[in-house]
């Protein structure tokens, strides 16, 4: 079972704590959950009309 936060202070005051690798703290459910990696795509070539939208690497299934 994964580590949750060391203390739960109720829904109005979540307390993020370190999670194991490949996990991050979800403020919504107040526990460590599986997480993918955010990434910023390489910029578009010069002259492109708008910056590339930010995307993410999918979590491991």
């Amino acid at each position: 079972m994964r580590r949750g936060p060391r203390s739960l202070r109720g829904r109005d005051a979540p307390a993020p704590t370190p999670c194991v690798p490949a996990e991050c703290f979800d403020l919504l459910v107040r526990h460590c959950v599986a997480c993918g990696l955010l990434r910023t795509p390489r910029p578009k070539p010069a002259g492109a009309s708008s910056p590339a939208p930010r995307t993410a690497l999918q979590p491991q299934e």
Epitope: M1, R2, G4, R11, D12, P14, P16, P18, C19, C24, F25, D26, L27, L28, V29, R30, H31, V33, A34, C35, G36, L37, L38, P53, R54, A56, L57, Q58, P59, E61
Partner: antibody
Amino acid sequence: EVQLVESGGGLVQPGGSLRLSCAASGFTISSNSIHWVRQAPGKGLEWVAWVTPGVGSTDYADSVKGRFTISADTSKNTAYLQMNSLRAEDTAVYYCARRVCYNRLGVCAGGMDYWGQGTLVTVSS
Amino acid sequence: DIQMTQSPSSLSASVGDRVTITCRASQDVSTAVAWYQQKPGKAPKLLIYSASFLYSGVPSRFSGSGSGTDFTLTISSLQPEDFATYYCQQSLMTPPTFGQGTKVEIK
């Protein structure tokens, strides 16, 4: 392929009970939180409940607290919504959804990325 | 609970138009906002999460911005398949509340 399939909806009288199931495939539910969201006919989306199967924690919308119970069986990779004391205002399409998270400075940045097809619950006499 | 207020509730637009939908939170939600698209009889689809991150497979004509209490979903050039209802949702704290929806119709 990630998939969520709901079942268990139907017609029930006020005060009655139903149990909805959400069978997941293509991922393990213990790694994510699973949510139930409902949509009354012609209305918007309303969150109902969530469960974190790997930890066993749950939470509910005030409108269903004390009447609905969310649970999960990790061995069956399935989440459930037990609905008791049903009211006419519970009539809706019920969706289960997976919350996906991406690591943003150690905190989840995410949303509900996979949804089931929905199951209709009608509460009427 | 945090209220999410969308505007407008509906709009009419033509193919190729730039469309902007706004969502206001009743309190600061940082960037914990997602946007969904829903077509009649179908489940919602995730478009944007964390206010400005485009979900995998979503066309780049969709973009999101904002933080704190004010958020925007923009469709840079409306396509026929974009006529649908759009919802914002905050996920900073339980309950994760949705906006009331914005229906984008054909002019």
